[in-house]
């Protein structure tokens, strides 16, 4: 990491140290110990206290972005006196110069791409590298394939998600011969940025009476079960006049995904489609492909 | 209509081990998590395990690893549950459930139970 | 001893309506983790009878309604009738267990 890390210490040092990679903040065990704490404080003075590690002179920090800049504080009680040390971690590099506008998005359940804009201040020789981290932290993934605007990464395509957990670290860091970088962060939800593909197999079939439709809950990459799916039907009868009403309807995902409805003989041509949606977040799937029943003549 | 038809009821010594069977009808077992859950009338309800699609593989319960043992035979669409080295406070209704929902894991629909009666 | 704490029994006339809670911890129900509701009639499986929180699965009547705020959870019956006698169960996940957790049961009885 290019950031410098300044130290804020009495004389005698805990020696505080962090690494990003692992979001580990350590210090020198003391002896005698009977009390320890760690903390980080952010630009918002939001106070982030994880718990200790068994050795109790480590910390982790499981879910923070560090892009704004943060202080990590240390307070440690030994039987003799007490220690207190703070540790500045800066988004050393010019100002402006981070990567912006960050997002990601899964689709086809096993795809996922990710873009960024150049910063505004960034050189023109400006370089960004897209490193990922799961929330169990026992891997990186390196960008594997990067998009490109005039040699510059602006995105990235990942074609194996199996590295990913339910929520994963992104972390943009950026490289230039003329001036520092600073580097962007963020923490993402996979359940908040997966785009659903439509319900797949969808199919009518009518009696004299109704006609039953059915479909197929689409693969996701989140491990979603049937309850977890809301799906909207848009039955449309053909050739009514602009600006009539489609019927919409909503139906919470089953084991049987099915929709039965009252349509009697004859009836006239209509079609289907569906969409899909977490049912918690209402993130709709685009449409499936019409399928038509009736006649012209009904 | 998916249903889960479960093996009859048993009686079996101390020490010995049991064989459940959990068959599901009307929906493939590849496409589906199963778990266990037992209930007994002084403990209630307690969850022993099952497939855990976000480790890709069947996770148990802390308090019976060791002694459980769930499998699945996706070609005929059963899951079993084999529970060893038999107490007297393994004597329960032990249930297989289909996870209709992974956030907070929700049950439905549930077999209708096997009685497992452990006596000397 | 259950995870989940619920009321034995309530009971309640026929019409009447009745409430039940089940109070959990910041592993499970606080974590936050959703919460589902069981009707369990005698000598049967339990039913699911509401998921996430508060939705209920498809055959359920919307007498059932259920809530969650904090680390607890309740579900309430309205309109009380006589094939509502049964027990009910709240269920969560819990992150200090890696699995499921549940209520001890609560008895309804219609008066």
């Known amino acids: 990491e290019k950031s410098d890390l300044r130290t804020v210490a009495p004389a005698s040092s805990l020696n505080v140290r962090f690494d990003s990679r692992t979001m580990n903040l350590s210090w020198d065990c003391q002896e005698n110990t009977t009390f320890s704490k760690c903390f980080l404080t952010d630009k918002k003075n939001r106070v982030v206290e994880p718990r200790l590690s068994n050795n109790e002179c480590s910390c982790t920090f499981r879910e923070i972005c560090l892009h704004e800049g943060v202080t990590f504080e240390v307070h440690v009680n030994t039987s003799q006196r007490g220690f207190q040390q703070k540790l500045l971690y800066p988004n050393s590099g010019r100002e402006g110069t981070a990567a912006q506008n960050f997002s990601c998005f899964i689709y086809n359940a096993d795809l996922m791409n990710c873009t960024w804009a150049r910063g505004p201040t960034a050189p023109r020789d400006v370089q960004y590298f897209l490193y990922i981290r799961n929330s169990k932290r026992r891997r990186e993934i390196r960008c594997p394939y990067y998009i490109q605007d005039s040699g510059t990464h602006v995105g990235c395509h990942l074609d194996n998600l199996s590295g990913l957990t339910s929520r994963n670290y992104f972390l943009v860091n950026g490289t230039s011969r003329e001036i520092g970088i600073q580097f962007f962060d963020s923490l993402l939800d996979t359940k908040k940025i997966e785009r659903f593909n439509p319900p797949s197999n969808v199919t009518v079939r009518c009696n004299t009476t109704h006609c039953l439709v059915r479909w197929k809950q689409p693969r996701t990459y989140q491990k979603l079960s049937y309850l977890d799916f809301q799906y909207q039907l848009d039955v449309h009868r053909k050739n009514t006049q602009p600006g009539t009403e489609n019927l919409l309807i909503n139906v919470s995902g089953d084991l049987e995904n099915r929709y039965n409805f009252p349509s009697s003989e004859p009836r006239a041509k209509h079609s289907v489609k569906i969409r899909a949606a977490d049912v918690r977040i209402l993130n709709w799937s685009s449409w499936s492909e019409a399928i038509e029943f009736g006649s012209d003549d009904g | 209509q998916v249903q889960l038809v479960q093996s009859g009821a048993e009686v079996k010594k101390p020490g010995a081990s049991v064989k459940v069977s959990c068959k599901i009808s009307g929906h493939s077992l590849s496409e589906l998590s199963i778990h266990w859950v037992r209930q007994t009338p002084t403990k209630g309800f307690e969850w022993m395990g099952g497939?855990?699609?976000?480790?890709?593989?069947?996770v148990y319960a802390q308090r019976f690893q060791g002694r459980v043992t769930m499998t699945e035979d996706t070609s005929i669409d059963t899951a079993y549950l084999t529970l060893s080295s038999l107490r007297s406070d393994d004597t329960a209704v032990y249930y297989c459930a289909i996870v209709g929902s992974f956030s907070g894991l929700a049950y439905r629909p549930w077999g209708k139970g096997t009685m497992v009666t452990i006596s000397s | 001893q259950a995870v989940l704490t619920q009321p034995s029994s309530v009971s309640g006339a026929p019409g009447q309506r009745v409430t039940i809670s089940c109070t959990g911890s910041?592993?499970?129900?606080?974590?936050?983790?959703?919460v589902s509701w069981y009707q369990q009639l005698p000598g049967t499986a339990p039913k699911l009878l509401i998921y996430?929180?508060?939705k209920r699965p498809s055959g359920v009547p919307d007498r059932f309604s259920a809530s969650k705020s904090g680390t607890s959870a309740s579900l309430a019956i309205t309109g009380l009738q006589a094939d509502d006698e049964a027990d009910y169960y709240c269920q969560s996940y819990d992150s200090s267990l890696s699995g499921s957790v549940f209520g001890g049961g609560t008895k309804v009885t219609v008066l």
């Open positions: 996430h929180n508060n």
């Open positions: 497939f855990d699609p976000e480790e890709n593989e069947i």
């Open positions: 910041g592993s499970n129900i606080g974590a936050p983790y959703d």
